[in-house]
Interface confidence: medium
Amino acid sequence: SQVSQNCHNGSYEISVLMMGNSAFAEPLKNLEDAVNEGLEIVRGRLQNAGLNVTVNATFMYSDGLIHNSGDCRSSTCEGLDLLRKISNAQRMGCVLIGPSCTYSTFQMYLDTELSYPMISAGSFGLSCDYKETLTRLMSPARKLMYFLVNFWKTNDLPFKTYSWSTSYVYKNGTETEDCFWYLNALEASVSYFSHELGFKVVLRQDKEFQDILMDHNRKSNVIIMCGGPEFLYKLKGDRAVAEDIVIILVDLFNDQYFEDNVTAPDYMKNVLVLTLSPGNSLLNSSFSRNLSPTKRDFALAYLNGILLFGHMLKIFLENGENITTPKFAHAFRNLTFEGYDGPVTLDDWGDVDSTMVLLYTSVDTKKYKVLLTYDTHVNKTYPVDMSPTFTWKNSKLPNDITGRGPQ
Protein backbone atom coordinates (compact mmCIF):
# COMPACT_ATOMS: atom_id res chain seq x y z
CA SER A 1 0.00 0.00 0.00
CA GLN A 2 1.10 3.57 -0.65
CA VAL A 3 2.70 5.19 2.41
CA SER A 4 2.34 8.96 2.59
CA GLN A 5 5.38 10.99 3.60
CA ASN A 6 4.96 13.61 6.29
CA CYS A 7 7.18 15.90 4.37
CA HIS A 8 5.59 19.10 3.09
CA ASN A 9 3.74 22.31 3.98
CA GLY A 10 6.53 23.50 6.26
CA SER A 11 6.53 20.32 8.36
CA TYR A 12 9.31 17.79 7.85
CA GLU A 13 9.59 14.56 9.77
CA ILE A 14 12.50 12.16 10.20
CA SER A 15 11.69 8.48 10.82
CA VAL A 16 14.29 7.06 13.18
CA LEU A 17 14.33 3.28 13.52
CA MET A 18 15.21 2.30 17.08
CA MET A 19 16.14 -1.33 16.64
CA GLY A 20 16.93 -3.77 19.41
CA ASN A 21 19.49 -5.37 17.13
CA SER A 22 22.17 -2.86 16.49
CA ALA A 23 25.73 -2.63 15.19
CA PHE A 24 26.84 -1.41 18.62
CA ALA A 25 25.28 -2.24 21.97
CA GLU A 26 24.28 1.33 22.64
CA PRO A 27 21.35 2.21 24.91
CA LEU A 28 18.57 3.60 22.73
CA LYS A 29 18.28 6.54 25.13
CA ASN A 30 21.76 7.71 24.08
CA LEU A 31 20.78 7.54 20.43
CA GLU A 32 17.62 9.51 21.18
CA ASP A 33 19.76 12.16 22.87
CA ALA A 34 22.02 12.33 19.84
CA VAL A 35 19.04 12.69 17.48
CA ASN A 36 17.48 15.40 19.65
CA GLU A 37 20.75 17.32 19.83
CA GLY A 38 20.94 17.11 16.05
CA LEU A 39 17.40 18.40 15.70
CA GLU A 40 18.22 21.45 17.81
CA ILE A 41 21.18 22.28 15.57
CA VAL A 42 19.15 21.76 12.38
CA ARG A 43 16.35 24.00 13.60
CA GLY A 44 18.89 26.70 14.39
CA ARG A 45 20.56 26.43 11.00
CA LEU A 46 17.26 26.57 9.13
CA GLN A 47 16.14 29.55 11.17
CA ASN A 48 19.41 31.35 10.45
CA ALA A 49 18.79 30.75 6.76
CA GLY A 50 15.38 32.40 7.05
CA LEU A 51 13.48 29.13 6.60
CA ASN A 52 10.57 29.06 9.00
CA VAL A 53 9.78 25.35 9.02
CA THR A 54 9.22 22.57 11.55
CA VAL A 55 11.54 19.58 11.76
CA ASN A 56 10.76 16.67 14.06
CA ALA A 57 11.78 13.07 14.55
CA THR A 58 9.53 10.07 15.10
CA PHE A 59 11.22 7.22 16.94
CA MET A 60 9.99 3.82 15.80
CA TYR A 61 10.63 0.95 18.20
CA SER A 62 10.40 -2.70 17.32
CA ASP A 63 8.90 -5.41 19.49
CA GLY A 64 11.67 -6.19 21.96
CA LEU A 65 10.06 -9.50 22.97
CA ILE A 66 10.54 -10.91 19.49
CA HIS A 67 13.81 -9.27 18.52
CA ASN A 68 15.92 -9.30 21.63
CA SER A 69 19.23 -10.90 20.67
CA GLY A 70 20.82 -7.45 20.82
CA ASP A 71 23.20 -8.16 17.98
CA CYS A 72 22.71 -8.14 14.23
CA ARG A 73 21.98 -11.82 13.65
CA SER A 74 18.21 -11.52 13.77
CA SER A 75 18.09 -8.01 12.38
CA THR A 76 16.76 -8.97 8.94
CA CYS A 77 13.32 -9.78 10.32
CA GLU A 78 13.33 -6.87 12.73
CA GLY A 79 13.98 -4.43 9.89
CA LEU A 80 11.17 -5.85 7.83
CA ASP A 81 8.83 -5.80 10.84
CA LEU A 82 9.56 -2.10 11.28
CA LEU A 83 8.85 -1.49 7.61
CA ARG A 84 5.54 -3.29 8.08
CA LYS A 85 4.79 -0.98 11.01
CA ILE A 86 5.43 2.03 8.79
CA SER A 87 3.25 0.52 6.09
CA ASN A 88 0.41 -0.20 8.52
CA ALA A 89 0.60 3.30 9.98
CA GLN A 90 0.58 4.67 6.40
CA ARG A 91 3.03 7.26 7.63
CA MET A 92 6.65 7.86 6.85
CA GLY A 93 9.04 10.76 7.29
CA CYS A 94 11.10 12.44 4.58
CA VAL A 95 14.04 10.23 5.45
CA LEU A 96 14.69 6.95 7.24
CA ILE A 97 17.55 6.91 9.74
CA GLY A 98 18.69 3.43 10.72
CA PRO A 99 19.11 0.48 10.56
CA SER A 100 22.77 -0.16 11.35
CA CYS A 101 23.04 -3.90 10.72
CA THR A 102 24.21 -4.99 7.29
CA TYR A 103 21.65 -7.81 7.08
CA SER A 104 18.68 -5.61 7.86
CA THR A 105 19.81 -2.70 5.68
CA PHE A 106 20.38 -5.00 2.72
CA GLN A 107 16.96 -6.64 3.13
CA MET A 108 15.11 -3.39 3.75
CA TYR A 109 16.75 -1.84 0.71
CA LEU A 110 15.58 -4.77 -1.40
CA ASP A 111 12.06 -4.79 -0.01
CA THR A 112 11.17 -1.14 -0.24
CA GLU A 113 10.31 1.15 -3.07
CA LEU A 114 13.03 3.57 -2.22
CA SER A 115 11.64 6.94 -3.08
CA TYR A 116 13.08 8.25 0.18
CA PRO A 117 16.67 8.42 1.41
CA MET A 118 17.98 5.92 3.96
CA ILE A 119 20.78 6.98 6.31
CA SER A 120 22.66 4.32 8.21
CA ALA A 121 25.08 4.39 11.13
CA GLY A 122 26.73 1.15 10.15
CA SER A 123 25.77 -1.27 7.36
CA PHE A 124 29.47 -1.98 6.95
CA GLY A 125 29.29 -4.94 4.56
CA LEU A 126 30.13 -5.02 0.86
CA SER A 127 26.52 -6.04 0.14
CA CYS A 128 25.49 -2.48 1.07
CA ASP A 129 27.93 -0.87 -1.39
CA TYR A 130 26.67 1.16 -4.35
CA LYS A 131 23.08 1.52 -3.16
CA GLU A 132 21.53 4.54 -4.83
CA THR A 133 19.50 5.91 -1.93
CA LEU A 134 21.56 4.59 0.98
CA THR A 135 24.00 6.83 2.84
CA ARG A 136 26.46 5.32 5.34
CA LEU A 137 27.98 7.55 8.00
CA MET A 138 30.49 5.09 9.43
CA SER A 139 33.42 3.80 7.37
CA PRO A 140 32.27 0.79 5.34
CA ALA A 141 34.42 -2.25 4.57
CA ARG A 142 35.20 -1.01 1.06
CA LYS A 143 37.14 1.95 2.48
CA LEU A 144 39.20 -0.34 4.70
CA MET A 145 40.02 -2.59 1.75
CA TYR A 146 41.23 0.31 -0.31
CA PHE A 147 43.52 1.47 2.49
CA LEU A 148 45.00 -1.98 2.97
CA VAL A 149 45.71 -2.47 -0.73
CA ASN A 150 47.22 1.01 -0.95
CA PHE A 151 49.42 0.37 2.09
CA TRP A 152 50.45 -3.10 0.92
CA LYS A 153 51.63 -1.63 -2.39
CA THR A 154 53.51 1.28 -0.84
CA ASN A 155 57.26 0.78 -1.11
CA ASP A 156 58.71 4.28 -1.33
CA LEU A 157 58.66 5.50 2.25
CA PRO A 158 61.74 5.43 4.49
CA PHE A 159 59.97 3.03 6.86
CA LYS A 160 58.33 0.85 4.18
CA THR A 161 60.60 -0.08 1.30
CA TYR A 162 58.91 -3.36 0.34
CA SER A 163 55.65 -3.89 -1.50
CA TRP A 164 53.61 -6.58 0.25
CA SER A 165 51.46 -9.13 -1.54
CA THR A 166 50.56 -11.59 1.22
CA SER A 167 48.62 -11.69 4.46
CA TYR A 168 46.99 -13.82 7.09
CA VAL A 169 43.57 -12.70 8.31
CA TYR A 170 42.44 -13.75 11.79
CA LYS A 171 38.66 -14.21 11.96
CA ASN A 172 37.17 -16.46 14.63
CA GLY A 173 33.48 -15.53 14.33
CA THR A 174 33.12 -13.73 17.66
CA GLU A 175 33.76 -10.28 16.21
CA THR A 176 31.70 -7.16 16.72
CA GLU A 177 29.45 -6.13 13.83
CA ASP A 178 31.95 -3.71 12.29
CA CYS A 179 34.82 -6.19 12.55
CA PHE A 180 32.69 -9.03 11.23
CA TRP A 181 32.01 -7.20 7.97
CA TYR A 182 35.51 -5.75 7.67
CA LEU A 183 37.04 -9.22 7.94
CA ASN A 184 34.31 -10.69 5.75
CA ALA A 185 35.33 -8.29 3.00
CA LEU A 186 38.98 -9.30 3.33
CA GLU A 187 38.01 -12.98 3.29
CA ALA A 188 35.72 -12.74 0.24
CA SER A 189 37.42 -14.35 -2.74
CA VAL A 190 35.96 -11.82 -5.18
CA SER A 191 36.88 -8.70 -3.21
CA TYR A 192 39.41 -6.07 -4.29
CA PHE A 193 41.69 -7.08 -1.42
CA SER A 194 41.77 -10.73 -2.47
CA HIS A 195 42.22 -9.79 -6.09
CA GLU A 196 45.29 -7.67 -5.35
CA LEU A 197 47.04 -10.12 -3.00
CA GLY A 198 49.04 -13.10 -4.16
CA PHE A 199 48.53 -15.07 -0.94
CA LYS A 200 45.88 -14.78 1.74
CA VAL A 201 44.83 -17.33 4.35
CA VAL A 202 42.13 -16.94 6.99
CA LEU A 203 43.05 -18.18 10.48
CA ARG A 204 39.93 -19.27 12.35
CA GLN A 205 41.33 -20.86 15.49
CA ASP A 206 43.25 -19.22 18.32
CA LYS A 207 45.88 -21.93 18.05
CA GLU A 208 46.39 -21.27 14.33
CA PHE A 209 47.09 -17.63 15.11
CA GLN A 210 49.40 -18.49 18.01
CA ASP A 211 51.36 -21.00 15.95
CA ILE A 212 51.98 -18.54 13.11
CA LEU A 213 53.73 -16.11 15.47
CA MET A 214 56.85 -18.34 15.62
CA ASP A 215 56.35 -20.62 12.61
CA HIS A 216 59.52 -20.62 10.47
CA ASN A 217 57.51 -21.90 7.51
CA ARG A 218 54.87 -19.21 7.60
CA LYS A 219 53.82 -17.86 4.21
CA SER A 220 53.43 -14.26 5.35
CA ASN A 221 54.78 -12.03 8.10
CA VAL A 222 51.64 -9.91 8.14
CA ILE A 223 48.50 -10.71 10.13
CA ILE A 224 45.35 -8.60 9.97
CA MET A 225 42.90 -8.71 12.83
CA CYS A 226 40.12 -6.50 14.13
CA GLY A 227 39.38 -5.39 17.68
CA GLY A 228 41.02 -3.58 20.57
CA PRO A 229 44.33 -4.20 22.37
CA GLU A 230 42.58 -6.33 25.02
CA PHE A 231 41.22 -8.60 22.29
CA LEU A 232 44.74 -9.06 20.97
CA TYR A 233 46.13 -9.75 24.44
CA LYS A 234 43.56 -12.49 25.11
CA LEU A 235 44.73 -14.17 21.96
CA LYS A 236 48.45 -13.50 22.02
CA GLY A 237 49.19 -13.11 25.70
CA ASP A 238 52.89 -12.75 26.38
CA ARG A 239 53.93 -15.27 23.76
CA ALA A 240 57.16 -14.67 21.89
CA VAL A 241 56.73 -13.24 18.43
CA ALA A 242 59.18 -13.57 15.53
CA GLU A 243 60.96 -10.27 14.91
CA ASP A 244 59.58 -9.77 11.41
CA ILE A 245 55.92 -10.34 12.26
CA VAL A 246 53.66 -7.33 11.74
CA ILE A 247 50.15 -7.39 13.20
CA ILE A 248 47.71 -4.89 11.73
CA LEU A 249 45.03 -4.27 14.32
CA VAL A 250 41.94 -2.65 12.80
CA ASP A 251 40.23 -0.65 15.53
CA LEU A 252 38.59 2.20 13.67
CA PHE A 253 36.08 3.44 16.21
CA ASN A 254 38.29 3.82 19.25
CA ASP A 255 39.63 7.19 20.39
CA GLN A 256 41.56 5.79 23.36
CA TYR A 257 44.90 5.72 21.55
CA PHE A 258 44.91 9.51 21.40
CA GLU A 259 44.29 10.15 25.10
CA ASP A 260 47.19 11.86 26.86
CA ASN A 261 47.88 9.35 29.61
CA VAL A 262 47.73 6.20 27.47
CA THR A 263 50.81 4.00 27.48
CA ALA A 264 51.07 1.17 24.99
CA PRO A 265 51.45 -2.22 26.65
CA ASP A 266 54.50 -4.28 25.70
CA TYR A 267 52.48 -6.77 23.67
CA MET A 268 51.61 -3.95 21.20
CA LYS A 269 55.18 -3.40 20.02
CA ASN A 270 54.77 -5.62 16.91
CA VAL A 271 51.41 -4.04 16.13
CA LEU A 272 50.29 -1.27 13.81
CA VAL A 273 46.88 0.05 14.83
CA LEU A 274 44.53 1.36 12.16
CA THR A 275 42.02 3.79 13.60
CA LEU A 276 40.16 6.93 12.62
CA SER A 277 41.44 10.42 13.22
CA PRO A 278 39.72 11.60 16.40
CA GLY A 279 37.19 14.41 16.33
CA ASN A 280 37.99 17.84 17.72
CA SER A 281 35.20 18.61 20.13
CA LEU A 282 33.49 15.29 20.63
CA LEU A 283 35.14 14.46 23.95
CA ASN A 284 33.50 17.48 25.56
CA SER A 285 30.10 17.35 23.90
CA SER A 286 27.04 16.98 26.08
CA PHE A 287 25.66 13.88 24.38
CA SER A 288 28.95 11.99 24.37
CA ARG A 289 30.00 12.36 27.99
CA ASN A 290 28.36 9.10 29.00
CA LEU A 291 29.65 7.16 26.02
CA SER A 292 32.68 4.92 25.89
CA PRO A 293 35.29 5.87 23.28
CA THR A 294 34.13 3.06 20.99
CA LYS A 295 30.50 4.19 21.13
CA ARG A 296 31.04 7.86 20.38
CA ASP A 297 31.26 7.30 16.65
CA PHE A 298 27.97 5.41 16.59
CA ALA A 299 26.00 8.10 18.41
CA LEU A 300 27.80 10.76 16.38
CA ALA A 301 26.71 9.05 13.15
CA TYR A 302 23.06 9.30 14.27
CA LEU A 303 23.56 12.97 15.10
CA ASN A 304 25.31 13.62 11.78
CA GLY A 305 22.49 11.82 9.99
CA ILE A 306 20.12 14.46 11.32
CA LEU A 307 22.52 17.25 10.30
CA LEU A 308 22.84 15.74 6.82
CA PHE A 309 19.08 15.73 6.43
CA GLY A 310 18.99 19.35 7.60
CA HIS A 311 21.66 20.26 5.07
CA MET A 312 19.75 18.68 2.17
CA LEU A 313 16.42 20.09 3.33
CA LYS A 314 17.92 23.58 3.42
CA ILE A 315 19.33 23.24 -0.12
CA PHE A 316 16.07 21.93 -1.58
CA LEU A 317 13.90 24.50 0.19
CA GLU A 318 16.17 27.36 -0.87
CA ASN A 319 15.93 26.13 -4.46
CA GLY A 320 12.17 25.75 -4.22
CA GLU A 321 12.37 22.02 -4.93
CA ASN A 322 10.07 19.25 -3.80
CA ILE A 323 11.34 17.00 -0.99
CA THR A 324 9.23 13.93 -1.80
CA THR A 325 10.90 13.23 -5.13
CA PRO A 326 13.43 10.69 -6.37
CA LYS A 327 15.81 13.60 -6.91
CA PHE A 328 15.84 14.28 -3.15
CA ALA A 329 16.19 10.56 -2.37
CA HIS A 330 19.24 10.31 -4.65
CA ALA A 331 20.88 13.57 -3.52
CA PHE A 332 22.54 12.37 -0.32
CA ARG A 333 25.96 11.75 -1.89
CA ASN A 334 28.94 13.46 -3.50
CA LEU A 335 28.79 16.36 -1.07
CA THR A 336 30.31 17.88 2.04
CA PHE A 337 28.12 19.08 4.90
CA GLU A 338 28.82 20.68 8.25
CA GLY A 339 28.74 17.81 10.74
CA TYR A 340 28.69 18.08 14.51
CA ASP A 341 32.44 17.92 14.64
CA GLY A 342 33.43 19.64 11.40
CA PRO A 343 32.96 18.98 7.68
CA VAL A 344 31.73 15.51 6.67
CA THR A 345 32.35 14.35 3.10
CA LEU A 346 30.26 11.72 1.35
CA ASP A 347 31.58 9.99 -1.76
CA ASP A 348 29.77 9.38 -5.04
CA TRP A 349 27.91 6.46 -3.44
CA GLY A 350 26.89 8.19 -0.23
CA ASP A 351 29.59 6.62 1.94
CA VAL A 352 31.42 8.74 4.46
CA ASP A 353 35.01 9.61 3.73
CA SER A 354 37.45 9.95 6.57
CA THR A 355 41.07 10.15 7.58
CA MET A 356 42.38 6.80 8.72
CA VAL A 357 45.44 6.85 10.98
CA LEU A 358 48.06 4.14 11.28
CA LEU A 359 49.73 4.12 14.69
CA TYR A 360 52.85 2.36 15.94
CA THR A 361 54.26 1.90 19.43
CA SER A 362 57.42 3.92 20.01
CA VAL A 363 60.07 1.72 21.61
CA ASP A 364 61.49 4.86 23.24
CA THR A 365 58.40 6.35 24.83
CA LYS A 366 55.96 3.38 24.90
CA LYS A 367 53.40 5.76 23.45
CA TYR A 368 51.26 5.33 20.37
CA LYS A 369 52.59 7.55 17.59
CA VAL A 370 51.12 8.43 14.21
CA LEU A 371 53.04 6.74 11.42
CA LEU A 372 50.89 7.90 8.51
CA THR A 373 47.41 8.97 7.60
CA TYR A 374 45.21 7.93 4.71
CA ASP A 375 42.53 10.05 3.07
CA THR A 376 39.78 7.71 1.87
CA HIS A 377 38.39 10.40 -0.41
CA VAL A 378 41.43 10.44 -2.69
CA ASN A 379 42.81 6.98 -1.75
CA LYS A 380 46.10 8.52 -0.75
CA THR A 381 48.65 7.93 2.01
CA TYR A 382 50.39 10.82 3.77
CA PRO A 383 53.43 9.98 5.91
CA VAL A 384 53.73 11.69 9.29
CA ASP A 385 56.72 10.16 11.08
CA MET A 386 59.51 9.62 8.58
CA SER A 387 61.90 8.27 11.25
CA PRO A 388 59.76 6.03 13.45
CA THR A 389 61.25 4.34 16.49
CA PHE A 390 60.00 0.89 15.54
CA THR A 391 60.66 -2.44 17.17
CA TRP A 392 61.47 -3.82 13.72
CA LYS A 393 65.04 -4.07 12.44
CA ASN A 394 66.56 -0.82 11.12
CA SER A 395 63.31 0.93 12.05
CA LYS A 396 61.78 -0.32 8.81
CA LEU A 397 58.78 -2.53 8.29
CA PRO A 398 59.99 -5.97 7.25
CA ASN A 399 59.25 -7.72 4.00
CA ASP A 400 56.00 -9.68 4.07
CA ILE A 401 57.79 -12.91 3.15
CA THR A 402 60.73 -14.03 5.26
CA GLY A 403 63.99 -14.26 3.36
CA ARG A 404 62.80 -12.37 0.30
CA GLY A 405 65.13 -9.52 -0.64
CA PRO A 406 64.23 -6.07 -1.99
CA GLN A 407 61.65 -6.11 -4.76
Epitope: N150, D156, V370, T373, D375, V378, K380, V384, M386, S387
Partner: antibody
Protein backbone atom coordinates in the same frame (compact mmCIF):
# COMPACT_ATOMS: atom_id res chain seq x y z
CA UNK B 1 70.24 16.69 -13.07
CA UNK B 2 66.54 16.39 -12.22
CA UNK B 3 64.51 17.54 -15.21
CA UNK B 4 60.94 17.61 -16.49
CA UNK B 5 60.25 18.46 -20.13
CA UNK B 6 56.72 18.99 -21.45
CA UNK B 7 55.72 18.64 -25.10
CA UNK B 8 52.62 18.24 -27.25
CA UNK B 9 51.14 21.72 -26.93
CA UNK B 10 49.87 23.71 -29.88
CA UNK B 11 46.78 25.07 -31.58
CA UNK B 12 43.62 22.97 -31.42
CA UNK B 13 40.01 23.67 -32.39
CA UNK B 14 37.21 23.77 -29.80
CA UNK B 15 35.90 20.26 -29.22
CA UNK B 16 39.24 18.78 -30.24
CA UNK B 17 41.69 16.63 -28.30
CA UNK B 18 45.35 16.90 -27.37
CA UNK B 19 47.82 14.72 -25.53
CA UNK B 20 50.61 16.38 -23.56
CA UNK B 21 53.77 14.52 -22.54
CA UNK B 22 56.13 15.07 -19.65
CA UNK B 23 59.51 13.35 -19.93
CA UNK B 24 61.26 12.91 -16.58
CA UNK B 25 64.97 12.34 -16.04
CA UNK B 26 67.53 12.40 -13.25
CA UNK B 27 65.38 10.72 -10.56
CA UNK B 28 63.50 7.49 -9.77
CA UNK B 29 60.35 8.29 -11.71
CA UNK B 30 58.09 5.62 -10.19
CA UNK B 31 58.60 6.88 -6.62
CA UNK B 32 57.20 10.40 -7.08
CA UNK B 33 53.70 11.71 -7.56
CA UNK B 34 53.62 13.51 -10.91
CA UNK B 35 51.24 16.44 -11.40
CA UNK B 36 49.80 18.65 -14.09
CA UNK B 37 49.20 22.34 -13.31
CA UNK B 38 47.98 24.95 -15.77
CA UNK B 39 48.08 28.73 -16.03
CA UNK B 40 45.75 30.68 -18.31
CA UNK B 41 47.26 33.86 -19.85
CA UNK B 42 47.61 36.52 -17.14
CA UNK B 43 45.96 34.25 -14.55
CA UNK B 44 47.00 32.17 -11.56
CA UNK B 45 48.05 28.54 -11.17
CA UNK B 46 45.43 25.79 -11.24
CA UNK B 47 46.08 22.18 -10.22
CA UNK B 48 44.65 19.60 -12.65
CA UNK B 49 45.60 16.23 -11.18
CA UNK B 50 48.28 13.74 -10.19
CA UNK B 51 49.48 10.20 -10.80
CA UNK B 52 51.73 7.82 -8.88
CA UNK B 53 53.71 5.89 -11.52
CA UNK B 54 54.44 2.89 -9.26
CA UNK B 55 50.78 1.85 -9.03
CA UNK B 56 49.18 4.25 -11.53
CA UNK B 57 46.86 5.66 -8.89
CA UNK B 58 45.39 8.92 -10.18
CA UNK B 59 43.49 11.82 -8.67
CA UNK B 60 42.00 14.38 -11.04
CA UNK B 61 40.34 17.58 -9.82
CA UNK B 62 36.53 17.38 -10.02
CA UNK B 63 36.51 20.26 -12.50
CA UNK B 64 38.47 18.22 -15.06
CA UNK B 65 37.39 14.65 -14.30
CA UNK B 66 35.04 14.30 -17.27
CA UNK B 67 37.47 15.57 -19.91
CA UNK B 68 41.06 15.04 -18.75
CA UNK B 69 42.89 11.77 -18.11
CA UNK B 70 46.37 11.33 -16.63
CA UNK B 71 48.51 8.30 -17.43
CA UNK B 72 52.13 7.16 -17.34
CA UNK B 73 54.55 5.00 -19.26
CA UNK B 74 57.09 3.75 -16.72
CA UNK B 75 59.36 2.35 -19.43
CA UNK B 76 59.63 5.82 -20.95
CA UNK B 77 59.70 7.69 -17.62
CA UNK B 78 56.87 9.83 -18.95
CA UNK B 79 53.56 11.18 -17.69
CA UNK B 80 50.75 12.19 -20.02
CA UNK B 81 47.72 14.46 -19.94
CA UNK B 82 44.98 13.49 -22.38
CA UNK B 83 42.60 16.42 -22.90
CA UNK B 84 39.29 15.92 -24.70
CA UNK B 85 36.39 18.23 -25.63
CA UNK B 86 38.69 21.24 -25.39
CA UNK B 87 37.21 24.71 -24.91
CA UNK B 88 38.56 28.22 -25.41
CA UNK B 89 38.93 28.56 -21.63
CA UNK B 90 41.41 25.65 -21.62
CA UNK B 91 43.91 27.91 -23.35
CA UNK B 92 46.87 27.97 -20.97
CA UNK B 93 50.46 26.99 -20.33
CA UNK B 94 50.44 23.44 -18.97
CA UNK B 95 53.17 22.53 -16.50
CA UNK B 96 54.35 19.15 -15.30
CA UNK B 97 55.70 19.03 -11.74
CA UNK B 98 56.44 16.47 -9.06
CA UNK B 99 55.81 16.15 -5.33
CA UNK B 100 58.76 15.53 -3.11
CA UNK B 101 58.22 14.18 0.40
CA UNK B 102 60.98 15.42 2.72
CA UNK B 103 62.48 13.44 5.57
CA UNK B 104 60.39 15.54 7.98
CA UNK B 105 57.20 14.44 6.19
CA UNK B 106 56.39 17.65 4.29
CA UNK B 107 55.32 17.50 0.66
CA UNK B 108 55.32 20.11 -2.07
CA UNK B 109 56.20 20.70 -5.73
CA UNK B 110 59.98 20.99 -5.96
CA UNK B 111 60.72 20.57 -9.67
CA UNK B 112 58.75 22.03 -12.58
CA UNK B 113 58.98 21.71 -16.34
CA UNK B 114 59.23 24.75 -18.59
CA UNK B 115 55.57 24.41 -19.63
CA UNK B 116 53.87 23.88 -22.98
CA UNK B 117 51.32 26.29 -24.45
CA UNK B 118 47.92 24.99 -25.52
CA UNK B 119 45.75 27.35 -27.56
CA UNK B 120 42.12 26.42 -28.18
CA UNK B 121 40.70 28.54 -30.95
CA UNK B 122 38.79 28.23 -34.20
CA UNK C 1 38.65 22.63 -1.76
CA UNK C 2 40.62 24.83 0.61
CA UNK C 3 40.56 28.39 -0.74
CA UNK C 4 43.63 30.59 -0.39
CA UNK C 5 43.28 34.38 -0.51
CA UNK C 6 46.39 36.49 -0.98
CA UNK C 7 46.70 40.16 -0.17
CA UNK C 8 47.51 42.49 -1.68
CA UNK C 9 46.86 41.44 -5.27
CA UNK C 10 49.58 43.79 -6.44
CA UNK C 11 52.15 45.93 -4.75
CA UNK C 12 54.74 48.53 -5.76
CA UNK C 13 57.98 48.77 -3.85
CA UNK C 14 61.57 49.92 -4.23
CA UNK C 15 64.88 48.12 -4.02
CA UNK C 16 65.85 47.81 -0.35
CA UNK C 17 62.25 47.91 0.93
CA UNK C 18 60.87 45.36 3.35
CA UNK C 19 57.81 43.68 1.81
CA UNK C 20 55.13 41.48 3.36
CA UNK C 21 52.55 39.38 1.52
CA UNK C 22 49.80 37.52 3.38
CA UNK C 23 47.87 34.37 2.55
CA UNK C 24 44.69 33.31 4.34
CA UNK C 25 43.26 29.78 4.07
CA UNK C 26 39.54 29.01 4.27
CA UNK C 27 40.37 26.25 6.78
CA UNK C 28 43.43 25.15 8.70
CA UNK C 29 46.29 23.66 6.69
CA UNK C 30 48.04 22.36 9.81
CA UNK C 31 48.96 18.69 9.82
CA UNK C 32 50.47 16.92 12.83
CA UNK C 33 52.56 19.81 14.07
CA UNK C 34 53.43 21.43 10.76
CA UNK C 35 51.69 23.70 8.27
CA UNK C 36 51.48 22.42 4.72
CA UNK C 37 51.82 25.79 3.04
CA UNK C 38 54.35 26.83 0.41
CA UNK C 39 55.39 30.05 -1.33
CA UNK C 40 56.48 30.16 -4.98
CA UNK C 41 58.00 32.91 -7.09
CA UNK C 42 57.17 33.18 -10.79
CA UNK C 43 58.72 35.42 -13.39
CA UNK C 44 57.10 36.12 -16.79
CA UNK C 45 57.44 33.20 -19.21
CA UNK C 46 59.01 30.96 -16.55
CA UNK C 47 57.81 28.12 -14.34
CA UNK C 48 57.16 28.76 -10.63
CA UNK C 49 60.14 28.37 -8.30
CA UNK C 50 59.80 27.10 -4.72
CA UNK C 51 60.86 29.62 -2.05
CA UNK C 52 59.40 28.42 1.24
CA UNK C 53 57.87 25.09 2.28
CA UNK C 54 56.06 24.04 5.47
CA UNK C 55 55.23 27.73 6.11
CA UNK C 56 58.69 28.75 7.29
CA UNK C 57 61.40 26.48 5.88
CA UNK C 58 63.68 27.99 3.25
CA UNK C 59 64.04 25.91 0.08
CA UNK C 60 67.50 24.98 -1.09
CA UNK C 61 69.36 27.82 -2.85
CA UNK C 62 66.89 30.53 -1.82
CA UNK C 63 68.44 33.72 -0.35
CA UNK C 64 67.93 34.28 3.38
CA UNK C 65 66.17 37.61 2.78
CA UNK C 66 63.05 35.50 2.11
CA UNK C 67 61.22 34.21 5.18
CA UNK C 68 57.84 32.70 5.94
CA UNK C 69 55.73 32.53 9.07
CA UNK C 70 52.27 31.59 10.28
CA UNK C 71 50.17 28.57 11.13
CA UNK C 72 46.58 27.40 10.92
CA UNK C 73 44.93 29.75 8.44
CA UNK C 74 47.14 32.87 8.39
CA UNK C 75 50.54 33.02 6.70
CA UNK C 76 53.07 35.64 5.71
CA UNK C 77 55.92 35.85 3.22
CA UNK C 78 58.46 38.54 4.00
CA UNK C 79 61.29 39.86 1.85
CA UNK C 80 63.55 41.77 4.23
CA UNK C 81 65.39 43.88 1.64
CA UNK C 82 64.12 43.84 -1.94
CA UNK C 83 66.61 43.13 -4.69
CA UNK C 84 66.04 43.90 -8.40
CA UNK C 85 65.60 40.18 -9.19
CA UNK C 86 62.76 39.86 -6.65
CA UNK C 87 60.20 41.69 -8.80
CA UNK C 88 57.87 38.89 -9.81
CA UNK C 89 54.53 37.29 -8.95
CA UNK C 90 54.30 35.29 -5.70
CA UNK C 91 51.87 32.44 -5.02
CA UNK C 92 51.02 30.61 -1.83
CA UNK C 93 49.96 26.97 -2.12
CA UNK C 94 48.49 24.44 0.31
CA UNK C 95 49.06 20.69 0.15
CA UNK C 96 46.88 19.78 3.16
CA UNK C 97 43.86 18.70 1.11
CA UNK C 98 44.55 18.19 -2.57
CA UNK C 99 46.40 21.23 -3.95
CA UNK C 100 45.27 24.82 -4.33
CA UNK C 101 47.07 28.08 -5.01
CA UNK C 102 46.37 31.64 -4.00
CA UNK C 103 45.45 34.06 -6.80
CA UNK C 104 48.93 35.59 -6.75
CA UNK C 105 50.54 38.86 -5.69
CA UNK C 106 52.34 40.88 -8.34
CA UNK C 107 55.33 42.75 -6.95
CA UNK C 108 56.31 45.68 -9.19
CA UNK C 109 59.04 48.32 -9.13
CA UNK C 110 57.83 51.65 -7.78
Amino acid sequence: EVQLVESGGGLVQPGGSLRLSCAASGFTFSSYWMHWVRQAPGKGLEWIGEIKPSNELTNVHEKFKDRFTISVDKAKNSAYLQMNSLRAEDTAVYYCTRTIITTEGYWFFDVWGQGTLVTVSS
Amino acid sequence: DIQLTQSPSSLSASVGDRVTITCRASESVDYYGSSLLQWYQQKPGKAPKLLIYAASKLASGVPSRFSGSGSGTDFTLTISSLQPEDFATYYCQQTRKAYTFGQGTKLEIK
